[in-house]
């Protein structure tokens, strides 16, 4: 097996998820609507797309997706997230699309979004956010 590092593998498809390689030799991983309460283990470092929407994920630990430097789209819509800690998206250098709608967030996860230099699309609708500070997206380009 692989080095035991936070459930990341060189190759592999998480149990019950659907995985399909794309035209760039990277992996699209669909783990949506599986009743998951936490992020799946055995994610390939070569994952470019990860759909975790419509699950029951209530919290993210800091740095839950280490070394996923090819990840371009992360879908976490329709979960039970109330808070996203600083460092939750550390190392996601290529992340362009982040879907966080339909959760239970009360604040814009400003610190977690810092340094997502590639981010182009962010969805936070259908949460419990009542106030958006004027500088909360200042770390984005």
């Amino acid at each position: 097996g692989s080095s035991p590092r936070s459930g990341v593998l060189l190759r592999g498809c998480p149990t019950h998820c659907h995985c399909e390689p794309d035209g760039r030799m990277l992996l699209r991983v669909d783990c949506s609507d599986l009743g998951l309460s936490e992020l799946p283990s055995n994610l390939s470092v070569f994952t470019s797309y990860l759909d975790l929407s419509m699950n029951n994920i209530s919290q993210l630990l800091p740095n839950p997706l280490p070394s996923l430097r090819f990840l371009e789209e992360l879908r976490l819509a329709g979960n039970a997230l109330t808070y996203i800690p600083k460092g939750a998206f550390t190392g996601l250098y290529s992340l362009k699309v982040l879907m966080l709608q339909n959760n239970q967030l009360r604040h814009v996860p400003t610190e977690a979004l810092q340094n997502l230099r590639s981010l182009q699309s962010l969805r936070l609708d259908a949460n419990h956010i009542s106030y958006v500070p004027p500088s909360c997206f200042s770390g984005l380009h």
Epitope: G1, S2, S3, R5, V8, L9, L10, R11, G12, C13, H18, C19, E20, P21, D22, G23, R24, M25, L26, L27, S44, V45, F46, P66, S67, R69, F70
Partner: antibody
Framework: EVQLVESGGGLVQPGGSLRLSCAAS????????ISWVRQAPGKGLEWVAE????????DYADSVKGRFTISADTSKNTAYLQMNSLRAEDTAVYYC?????????WGQGTLVTVSS | DIQMTQSPSSLSASVGDRVTITCRAS??????VAWYQQKPGKAPKLLIY???FLYSGVPSRFSGSGSGTDFTLTISSLQPEDFATYYC?????????FGQGTKVEIK
């Protein structure tokens, strides 16, 4: 131009050790994994070991686990395969290959012969 | 480990022939399959990846298809430089595994 150049092969006695090197150039070393794949004389291809340098992730075939160690030096863009407790069945041409999900470029190979 | 079984193990064909090689995985591997060409004394070369994507620089006479457990490599019109051994390989899980090879010889 992508280049992978293996070195370090040769004749070694059973139980002996060898260290293979794979010098990479022409691509971003930290954007790929490096694998070693071997081919015994007249036989097919067998994956041996792999490393993803940014995270230090490694993986091994069961046939070499505990005997072979893969490593990489990102400052030199070079991967290594330390082979200990060599057996006659380890005799093969050893190729290094760069990969994401698939092995898209291979070196020319280096021959390892284990014989007394 | 996932077993990859190729057929035939060898075939004889003429220049201009259409050649088909099949590969069967012992379990579902989605489309995580590649095909390689190897000539004697040389390193393998990637032809097809993700079951059906033609690798850069590979002639369009090569094509791949399949999903799940059954995969095919087709050479639409065999050329003299195509006489070689062809391997399929799965990357769905670790360890990545290869088929035993199909040798394409001149008839």
């Amino acid at each position: 131009e992508v280049q992978l150049v293996e070195s370090g092969g040769g004749l070694v006695q059973p139980g002996g050790s060898l260290r293979l090197s794979c010098a990479a150039s022409g691509f971003t070393f930290t954007s790929y994994s490096i694998s070693w794949v071997r081919q015994a004389p007249g036989k097919g291809l067998e994956w041996v070991a792999e490393i993803y340098p940014p995270g230090g992730y490694t993986d091994y075939a069961d046939s070499v686990k505990g005997r072979f160690t893969i490593s990489a030096d990102t400052s030199k863009n070079t991967a290594y395969l330390q082979m200990n407790s060599l057996r006659a069945e380890d005799t093969a041409v050893y190729y290094c290959a760069k990969a994401r999900l698939f092995f898209d470029y291979w070196g020319q190979g280096t021959l390892v012969t284990v014989s007394s | 480990d996932i077993q990859m079984t190729q057929s035939p193990s060898s075939l004889s064909a003429s220049v201009g022939d259409r050649v088909t090689i099949t590969c069967r995985a012992s379990q579902d591997v989605s489309t995580a399959v590649a095909w390689y060409q190897q000539k004697p004394g040389k390193a393998p070369k990637l032809l097809i990846y993700s079951a059906s994507f033609l690798y850069s620089g590979v002639p369009s006479r090569f094509s791949g298809s399949g999903s799940g457990t059954d995969f095919t490599l087709t050479i639409s019109s065999l050329q003299p430089e195509d006489f070689a051994t062809y391997y399929c390989q799965q990357s769905y899980t670790t360890p990545p595994t290869f088929g035993q090879g199909t040798k394409v010889e001149i008839k």
